[in-house]
Interface confidence: low
Amino acid sequence: TVPPMVNVTRSEASEGNITVTCRASSFYPRNIILTWRQDGVSLAHDTQQWGDVLPDGNGTYQTWVATRICRGEEQRFTCYMEHSGNHSTHPVPS
């Protein structure tokens, strides 16, 4: 088992909104849960966009999930990752 590296980034979206993206990379096996949470609770499926779980050329995998949130509410949001029985929670950078 190779645990993922998780990286959270933010980018400007429309006025008053930002897009936050959570990337998991270099993990094996390919089964992973990656989701955005607000106040600790997973966001609705249709408010998130997921990338495919793709091989990254080193025998491991990568994927991402993104959502759009209101600027100023960043600290209510976290990216939750679960892989091979281990889990972690990742905040939006300020």
Partner: antibody, heavy 122, light 112 residues
């Protein structure tokens, strides 16, 4: 599951403030949401607020926004709640509790501290 | 705020009986993500509450299978199939779908 150890009972005067602590062990503190709850003798429970230990982000029950302030100290894995401008109505047991969001489950108050009794009296 | 109403206030039982506790919310408590965050807690005298059921019907780890939760929308039920002495205490329902999260007033299960 870990442990949550709360500070001892407090006897305080009206108008004063009190800072309660909830020291945790046995789990990754910064991954967790900690809530504080109030229970007056013989009554039900009220949720006050939560704090996400990873960022210090908070969400309050509007009823308590002017009364409670939540903070964390990640170096000691301890959550704090400062309660201000105390009145006799604030006499209660205060609990800290840890949320459990492992996997696809979602349980709010999965693990509890033993509670701290606060008595407000002149 | 979502008002959680529990009935009955007190439920006298004989050991071995089935007990049924009711909880009604003042509005639908389906979260925006589609889950219903309805939980049941048991508080024994002088102790902290303990989580029994989460998301309506899921038993928390270590909770005996004599406890079962059901319901949807605004009406929820906790059943204890065969009441044991250790089950006596006050049961609270709780909704975590709408802020502020709120508890019911409690149902006290006691010996008849």
């Amino acid at each position: 599951q870990g442990q949550m150890q709360q500070s001892g009972a407090e006897l305080v005067k009206p108008g004063a403030s009190v800072k309660l602590s909830c020291k945790t062990s046995g789990f990754t503190f910064s991954d967790n949401y900690i809530s504080w709850l109030k229970q007056k003798p013989g009554q039900s429970l009220e949720w006050i607020a939560w704090i996400y230990a990873g960022t210090g982000g908070t969400s309050y029950n509007q009823k308590f926004t002017a009364k409670a302030q939540l903070t964390v100290d990640t170096s000691s894995s301890t959550a704090y709640m400062q309660f201000s401008s105390l009145t006799t109505e604030d006499s209660a047991i205060y609990y800290c509790a840890r949320h459990d969001y492992y996997g696809t489950s979602g349980a709010w108050f999965a693990y509890w501290g033993q509670g701290t009794l606060v008595t407000v009296s002149a | 705020d979502v008002l959680m109403t529990q009935t009955p206030l007190s439920l006298p039982v004989s050991l071995g009986d089935q007990a049924s506790l009711s909880c009604r919310s003042s509005q639908n408590i389906v979260h925006i993500n589609g889950n219903t965050y309805l939980e049941w807690y048991l508080q024994k005298p002088g102790q902290s509450p303990k989580l029994l059921i989460y998301k309506v019907s899921n038993r928390f780890s270590g909770v005996p299978d004599r406890f079962s939760g059901s319901g949807s929308g605004t009406d929820f039920t906790l059943k204890i199939s065969r009441v044991e002495a250790e089950d006596l205490g006050v049961y609270y329902c709780f909704q975590g779908s709408h802020v502020p999260w709120t508890f019911g007033g409690g149902t006290k299960v006691e010996i008849k």
